[in-house]
């Protein structure tokens, strides 16, 4: 049976050209978490694997940062990257763990805060 | 240039164990990626089995998880595979193969070993 | 287990010929989609990762494309080497998967 619940950062804005962390965690579960990865739509953005690392798609190895953590960093940020994030969480024996978030990024310099997990 | 060579007896009883060897020249086992194993059965069908990682974690297909057991020698830049309680389906080519992390694919195989499981 | 299927078993084709061999996951696996090439008498070759993306040294009239659960795999201009088992295989998930092959073979 599933019992782990996926917290994340929810509904996120930042500004175009700064950086945004993406994070997730998995409550509520005494299962191994054998890979994480994160996805925008319908592309691959980055793997965590808990035996080998991290794996960076090549369409993003300039902008994008593993870590903190399982969490994903995302940079020189442009309008084209607002949209749907998702986290999904491998684990062993329990199955898969799907987590979601929705970026916006803001022409305006004003950005709004807030998020748990937002960069300051 | 990175290269990888299985050995091993071509010919198992069943009910005994296969153990082969993959031999590992130009890259350091313990430097990086993970170490596989991937047999071919007669018809084509290519199954993982399992890798050893360079910190010497490892992860089986669970199909096999119960028969299988992948270890190294890392004086020898060695890595082993162990399969119990063989059975004529257990026949196929084996193959090791390094999995890259950078392009998360099988980068570079060996030549094969032909292995048959009869009595 | 992700099943990863190619429902042609072989293709024929002719030289010059543009061909396109086609793989279907049973579930999405987004882009963690590789491409192997197997020559008769040989081991496999690792040609497309990540979906789209050629590995080193790999001729340009090889390419990959797809997402979710439609995978295509397109020799622009096939030579006479081109004849091989290609293959399939995601990595989404840690029980990695193979399609069961394609054979190409040349008129």
């Known amino acids: 049976m599933m019992t782990g619940t996926i917290e994340t950062t929810g509904n996120i804005s930042a500004e175009k050209g700064g950086s945004i962390i993406l994070q997730c965690h998995l409550s509520s579960t005494t299962a191994q978490v054998t890979q994480v990865n994160w996805e925008q739509q319908d592309q691959l953005l980055a793997i965590c694997n808990a035996d080998l690392g991290w794996h960076i798609s090549p369409s993003f190895k300039d902008r994008v940062a593993p870590g903190p953590g399982l969490g994903l960093t995302l940079q020189s940020l442009t309008v084209n990257d607002t949209g749907e994030y998702f986290c999904i969480y491998h684990t062993y024996p329990d199955g898969t763990y799907t987590g979601r978030i929705f970026l916006e990024v803001l022409e305006s310099s004003v950005a709004e805060h807030g998020a748990r997990f937002q960069i300051p | 240039d990175v290269q990888l060579q299985e050995s091993g007896p071509g010919l198992v009883k069943p009910s005994q164990s296969l153990s082969l060897t993959c031999t590992v020249t130009?890259?350091?086992?313990?430097?990086?990626?993970?170490w596989n194993w991937i047999r071919q059965f007669p018809g084509n069908k290519l199954e993982w089995m399992g890798y050893?990682?360079?910190?010497?974690?490892?992860s089986y297909n669970p199909s096999l998880k119960s028969r299988i057991s992948i270890t190294r020698d890392t004086s020898k830049n060695q890595f082993f595979l162990q399969l119990n309680s063989v059975t004529t389906e257990d026949t196929a080519t084996y193959y090791c193969a390094r999995f890259m992390i950078t392009t998360f694919a099988m980068d570079y195989w060996g030549q094969g070993t032909a292995v048959t499981v009869s009595s | 287990d992700i099943v990863m299927t190619q429902s042609h078993k072989f293709m024929s084709t002719s030289v010059g010929d543009r061909v396109s061999i086609t793989c279907k996951a049973s579930q999405h696996v987004s882009t963690a989609v590789a491409w192997y090439q197997q020559k008769p008498g040989q081991s496999p070759k690792l040609l497309i990762y990540s979906a789209p993306y050629r590995y080193t040294g790999v001729p340009d009239r090889f390419t990959g494309s797809g997402s979710g659960t439609d995978f295509t795999f397109t020799i622009s201009s096939v030579q006479a080497e081109d004849l091989a088992v290609y293959y399939c295989?995601?990595?989404?998930?840690?029980?990695?998967?193979f399609g069961g092959g394609t054979k190409l073979e040349i008129k």
């Open positions: 050893i990682s360079y910190s010497g974690s490892t």
């Open positions: 130009g890259y350091s086992i313990t430097s990086d990626y993970a």
């Open positions: 295989q995601q990595h989404y998930n840690t029980l990695w998967t």
